[in-house]
């Protein structure tokens, strides 16, 4: 987290607010739930208090405009800048300004009022940008999801920073951004994508590029806004420029940002049996065509040319890969060789000898 | 309806530089990814450079660090700088909004000769 120069900060805890126009994408009353649920993110995690006035002079103006709207930072029409807040001062302190041109909602189309809002109020009360991509003062947009909103660790420590604790948080998870250099850090999966390599934890991914140490972390939501926030398996099917993310019962097909139309499916429309839950771990072998399904302790290979479930299987994993354990979380191939994820741990595997060549932290794909 | 036009394209020495544009027609460009493929004669069509609706870019490992793709909203444009081009870099590059599923310019030939 950051917080402003001088450490700008209110005095009091008590702040009011004003909605002095309305934007025509939504009604009032969706505005005000908005704008009410976006103060209560912070008032959660500090002792704040907020309360709304109609009319007069508040802490907080909240207004929409489009362009020049009278405080020399204009808006720039369609997306680009989509809102600004003043940091805690007098006049125009704390005051957030909303871009008109922008098309706000209550969903994941257009932007979504309540996150943009959340954002703006945390500029309102002291916070600058945070570095980290999983914060709500990340300075890109991402819409988060349906599912109810938590705020990120790092915001919460950046604004206790400043007014210290509530009495009592009423959600006290709040997601961490995971370490690469965790020596406990296990992964979720691994893919190739046109020659970076993607790894999967939580609701982020690091990217990779070759020849390349450091690793740049995105929320999964960033690329990918209509997939879920977590996946359980993932491969690449270069030739035909596709990767497929697997996550529950359901699978998706992705060419670079964008989902293949007919997608999500259902993994039983692969030829795995109904009582598979989840695929765990899964890899793309281009010499031939085939790719490992792993699931709980069993492994399954699917032909992808033929769009057909080998027979004989599924095996179990112990069996095929003897030593690499009887789960897998994540896998990929590179070079000839298999390397297996199981917790913290990762197996290099060699195709060639079918057996174990190297045991090393899974952690060490970060270069760490 | 998206249409897509290409311009840019052209003959250049090995170690010149291009920009290719992209004409969008249709008020819901902004709401696709923009990318560029390209295809060399008698070669299968491949990805050259991508941005994200969130402007987040992904290159082909053999252009990365020589073409950038940007794309402006307002103006319906998107463009591809094309640095330090390479004999290899010649082919016709095809503009595409949505994806392998989505919408396709005709295409703009490069020629780069050493």
């Known amino acids: 987290y950051n917080v402003f120069p001088r450490t700008l900060k209110w005095s009091k805890m008590n702040l009011t607010y004003r909605i002095v126009n309305y934007t025509p994408d939504m009604t009032h009353s969706e505005v005000e739930k908005a704008f009410k649920k976006a103060f209560k993110v912070w008032s959660d995690v500090t002792p704040l208090n907020f309360t709304r006035l109609h009319d007069g002079i508040a802490d907080i103006m909240i207004s929409f405009g489009i362009k020049e709207h009278g405080d020399f930072y204009p808006f720039d029409g369609p997306s680009g800048l989509l809102a600004h807040a003043f940091p805690p001062g007098p006049n125009y302190g704390g005051d957030a300004h909303f871009d008109d041109d922008e098309t706000w909602t209550s969903s994941s189309k257009g932007y979504n009022l309540f996150l943009v809002a959340a954002h703006e109020f945390g500029h309102s009360l002291g916070l600058d940008h945070s570095k980290d991509p999983g914060a709500l003062m990340f300075p890109i947009y991402t819409y988060t999801g349906k599912s109810h909103f938590m705020l990120p660790d790092d915001d919460v420590q950046g604004i206790q920073s400043l007014y210290g604790p509530g009495d009592e948080d009423p959600n006290p998870k709040h997601p961490k951004t995971p370490d690469k250099c965790d020596p406990s850090l296990s992964l979720d999966a691994i893919t190739s994508l046109r020659g970076e390599t993607m790894i999967f934890k939580d609701r982020f991914f690091w990217r990779l590029h070759p020849q390349q140490v450091d690793a740049e972390l995105f929320l999964t939501k960033s690329f990918w806004p209509e997939l879920p926030n977590r996946i359980d398996a993932a491969y690449e099917h270069p030739s035909h420029d596709l990767i497929f993310i697997f996550r529950g019962r359901k699978f998706w097909a992705l060419n670079g940002y964008d989902i293949l139309e007919g997608y999500p499916k259902k993994i039983s429309e692969l030829g795995l049996p109904k009582e598979v839950k989840k695929i765990s771990a899964a890899v793309h072998f281009e010499d031939t065509g085939k790719t490992l399904l792993f699931s709980g302790n069993q492994v399954w290979r699917y032909d992808d040319t033929n769009h057909i479930m080998d027979k004989d299987y599924p095996r179990l994993i112990e069996e095929d890969f003897p030593g690499i354990g009887d789960k897998v979380d994540a896998v990929y191939e590179k070079n000839g060789y298999i390397y297996f994820f199981n917790g913290p741990i990762q197996f290099e595997y060699s195709i060639w000898s079918n057996r174990i060549v190297r045991v090393m932290p899974a952690n060490s794909i970060l270069w760490c | 309806e998206v249409q897509l036009v290409e311009s840019g394209g052209g003959s250049v020495q090995a170690g010149g530089s291009l920009r290719l544009s992209c004409a969008a027609s249709?008020?819901?460009?902004?709401?696709?990814?923009m990318n560029w493929y390209r295809q060399a004669p008698g070669k299968q069509r491949e990805f050259v450079a991508g941005?994200?609706?969130?402007?987040?870019?992904n290159y082909a490992v053999s252009v990365r660090g020589r073409f950038t793709i940007s794309r402006d909203n307002a103006e319906g444009t998107g463009y591809l700088q094309m640095n330090s081009l390479k004999p290899e870099d010649t082919a016709v590059y095809y503009c595409?909004?949505?994806?392998?599923?989505?919408?396709w310019g005709l295409g703009t030939l490069v020629t780069v000769s050493s």
């Open positions: 249709g008020s819901t460009f902004s709401r696709y990814s």
């Open positions: 941005i994200s609706v969130g402007r987040i870019t």
């Open positions: 595409n909004a949505g994806g392998l599923q989505g919408y």
